[in-house]
Interface confidence: low
Amino acid sequence: ECVTTLFQDACFKGGDITVAFAPNAKHCQIICTHHPRCLLFTFMTESSSEDPTKWYTCILKDSVTETLPMVNMTGAISGYSSKQCLHHISACSKDMYVDLNMKGMNYNSSLAQSARECQQRCTDDTHCHFFTFATRHFPSIKDRNTCLLKNTQTGTPTSITKLHEVVSGFSLKSCGLSNLACIRDIFPRTAFVDITIDTVMAPDPFVCRSICTHHPSCLFFTFLSEEWPTASERNLCLLKTSSSGLPSARFRKNRAFSGFSLQHCQHSVPVFCHSSFYRNTDFLGEELDIVDADSHEACQKTCTNSIRCQFFTYSPSQESCNGGKGKCYLKLSANGSPTKILHGTGSISGYTLRLCKMDNVCTTKIKTRIVGGTQSVHGEWPWQITLHVTSPTQRHLCGGAIIGNQWILTAAHCFNEVKSPNVLRVYSGILNQSEIKEDTSFFGVQEIIIHDQYEKAESGYDIALLKLETAMNYTDSQWPICLPSKGDRNVMYTECWVTGWGYRKLRDKIQNTLQKAKVPLMTNEECQAGYREHRITSKMVCAGYREGGKDACKGDSGGPLSCKHNEVWHLVGITSWGEGCGQRERPGVYSNVVEYVDWILEKTQGP
């Protein structure tokens, strides 16, 4: 239950986890919300005690029952974490605190004209967590107009005291207001040296990056994958820092991934939401509860609805007598991450979705599908693009999918005859081809990147990336689709749609309105039975009906096979090839995007 009220002159009894310092109760609530285990807090104002060392203490609390007895206490303010609330959670704190000295390590001192200038300096300094500015009326003349940049291991002050003529505040990095370079790349086969400030367990480099982003002192990270040679170090996420703020060196290391904290990225709020399932994987941690569940999805839902659950492991039933229900182990730990990750266990693990309140663009829910019919409506498939070739005359060439603000994923065979990017135009937000006029805005293509193992569509590797000349701004009608996670390799998607302007039968023409068809995925074995003359590899995924009918066709190539999973749309396939269109036992064959995630990341984010 979400409780937003702050209780004045009240203190929660017991349940203490740790003590932090905060300038006010609102900020104490932010600290509690971002702490992996805090559910309740009590904040001590100046009137709470005659002992100044007790002032501004923010006591973080946890409780098995999710509440604690409340007792009267003058000057105390108590409340609940916002974890329980549905609204967007932000760590952004723009307030200035007059006559408060927030203490930490004073690692930089300089002159500033104002507290705002000092705050911006803190925001633009890699290491700064908070600052204290001495005004021009500060008693000590030599310290007037001094801007002290400070940090601590926890990101919060080590203490807060009253001090006249100073102003304190926090870095605005979490508000997206930093001018520091934002490097979103994850570098494969790379290990950063430098100081490791903390190690946690993570199932993949993306989770590791999120953990780094939310760790106050982590500036970059190295993740050792499950194939890392030293068994005891597998799945280790090494959180790192350096005095310069950037890695001092990097080494080529197979099975290691490295990247940067996203804490100071402009215009994006870091995501603390991991929706993937990790198959054949056990997350170890403190057990909160064991319940029956029909599936790993149901287990994740149970974990999400249980406020204290941070991650889970679902053990499918080996027997049929209990109705096929499996065991759902709800777990937690001190830092929100598994204490150990085991592989080859037959279990499926994952994280709570409770923290999915931090916008990750592609995971944002979009307009509800229109059920029935074959024609799409505006904004229904905002990642779908139409790729036009302008030479010798302009025409629709292929479909494609927006996967980043400068990246389109499509099929390699679209470029069998087209080699030059300057004859290509990407139109997004289009429903009808007739909307495209001479003055319709488009994105030019800077580079065509074709998979280097591509020979022909039927042999696989039918995948290509288009790098746009300019980055697109996301709108309701142009929006990226999420790539599937490698952890979702074995997910059986139940709601998949193929979209495109392609032919509706073998001898036809390009359609004016974007068409859609719901198609079920089928196993590669089932698909292979219909294509004896070709080899259906793991790099391909098939979709369609045994009896034929709904299918992709000429002109749909390169377009998306979009599947909904956990309320998020994933790009599961890229329309590649098939025998005829909608023929019986001849399903559509798509490039299996999950098999190319490393390649996509290497090309879009690598050096």
Epitope: N179, A181, S243, S244, L246, Q266, G444, E469, A471
Partner: antibody, heavy 116, light 107 residues
Amino acid sequence: QVQLEESGPGLVAPSQSLSITCTVSGFSLTGYGIYWVRQPPGKGLEWLGMIWGDGRTDYNSALKSRLSISKDNSKSQVFLKMNSLQTDDTARYYCARDYYGSKDYWGQGTTLTVSS
Amino acid sequence: DIVMTQSHKFMSTSVGDRVSITCKASQDVSTAVAWYQQKPGQSPKLLIYLTSYRNTGVPDRFTGSGSGTDFTFTISSVQAEDLAVYYCQQHYKTPYSFGGGTKLERL
């Protein structure tokens, strides 16, 4: 495609002010920072300042008091204004687009001569 | 402010040679250094950013290395079209700054 083009007065008298416009196409000024760099005849490159995507500015410390950078996103234009010009401000003035703090696309530059 | 120093104003080379240009920062700039090529009458062209990342379309004979205060730009096998002036630039902290430039000329 991405293009930047500078336009300036060419000749300015000493102690007068300078105004140069950088017109960009192929990308949005809300998403990219723009730098100004100059190069005196036969000499090296000097970083003058920049305007970030959201309008904030940074300047070369030595020139800060004489420089002003602004922009008009809707017209895709960035403006460099510099006052109290001296003969040693004679240079070719370039605008360039930000890329991780480096500059991936440059204009062709506009030549400024300060002379009476 | 950070000062970038390229100790050699000129370097002589022949086609096919391996050549290295050095650049020193007055303070630690980690790996935030870019290298540019400028030919007479042309605008500078970005070759390398973040010390070792080649810009799109830059041949792999151009490489960069270093960290902290000492940086090196290398052309593994000089081609005739590589004769130009090369500048380093720190993009660690504003105000950003360039080195004085090194002119690569025929021996």
